[in-house]
């Protein structure tokens, strides 16, 4: 997830200063030191699921 209102990027992406465009935050898992990863916020917690026997 990206930080709130990451301009001018859509949800799940962050602006790259070097490329001057939005990049997918998912790629930060493989390349965490890319510049735009600074703008990718912590992933939201997984939704709670009730486990039935």
């Amino acid at each position: 997830e990206q930080a709130p209102g990451t301009a001018p990027c859509s949800r799940g992406s962050s602006w790259s200063a070097d490329l001057d465009k939005c990049m997918d935050c998912a790629s930060c898992r493989a390349r965490p030191h890319s510049d735009f990863c600074l703008g990718c916020a912590a992933a939201p917690p997984a939704p709670f699921r009730l486990l039935w026997p």
């Epitope: 930080a3 709130p4 602006w15 070097d18 001057d20 510049d35 703008g39 916020a41 912590a42």
Partner: antibody, heavy 120, light 103 residues
């Protein structure tokens, strides 16, 4: 209200270590990158390090790489800077700051600053 | 990032024009104001957008390697040091600063 409160500065001998802390309140800490910036006496601003909201991405100025470590404890809403192998030239006021990705990585909230003096 | 001039001596009511030049092309730039004994304050982000609560006498412009901060009419509280800042190659960098002083 949104604020950053710093602690941990002081006098340390060359080669010594120190850990700075920055406690955040008034905003969703995990949603923001954070940074450390320093200012030597009578000098300009120098960026030191930055970390993403998750803590998974870290960035350092060449002058501190390998000596300083930035980290964050998101459940405690706290940012840290572990400073090792300190040198006289690390003497400065250290500021923590919130980095706004939606402000194209401008820093919009700053701590009050804490003085680190490296001297024998 | 190279800022010029190092010091600008002006009177209240005058226009201040501060320059920031990058060695390589920069896509966006921020500007900060700092007064003695205080933390910096964000004025301009994304080259030309004013941060929250910043009066409209402050404006930013520029592209590529040349950027400008303009204060249209200096107020007494505007006399301070101003820094530009970029983010490039995964490094945040500040300019050396411009001091705006009362002549």
């Amino acid at each position: 209200q949104v604020q950053l409160v710093q602690s941990g500065g002081g006098l340390v001998k060359p080669g010594g270590s120190l850990r700075l802390s920055c406690a955040a309140s008034g905003f969703t800490f995990t949603s923001y990158a954070m940074s450390w910036v320093r200012q030597a006496p009578g000098k300009g601003l120098e960026w030191v390090s930055a970390i993403s909201g998750s803590g998974g991405s870290t960035y350092y100025a060449d002058s501190v790489k390998g000596r300083f470590t930035i980290s964050r404890d998101n459940p405690k809403n706290t940012l840290y800077l572990q400073m090792n192998s300190l040198r006289a030239e690390d003497t400065a006021v250290y500021y923590c700051a919130r980095v706004r990705a939606n402000y194209y990585y401008g820093m919009d909230v700053w701590g009050q600053g804490t003085l680190v003096t490296v001297s024998s | 990032l190279t800022q010029s001039p190092g010091t600008l001596s002006l009177s209240p009511g005058e226009r201040a024009t501060l320059s920031c030049r990058a060695s390589q092309s920069v896509s966006r730039l921020a500007w900060y104001q700092q007064k003695p004994g205080q933390a910096p304050r964000l004025l301009i982000y994304g080259t030309s957008s004013r941060a929250t609560g910043i009066p409209d006498r402050f404006s930013g412009s520029g592209s590529g390697t040349d950027f400008t901060l303009t204060i249209s009419r200096l107020e007494p509280e505007d006399f301070a040091v101003y820094y530009c800042q970029q983010f490039r190659n995964s490094l945040l960098t500040f300019g050396g600063g411009t001091k705006v002083e009362i002549t």
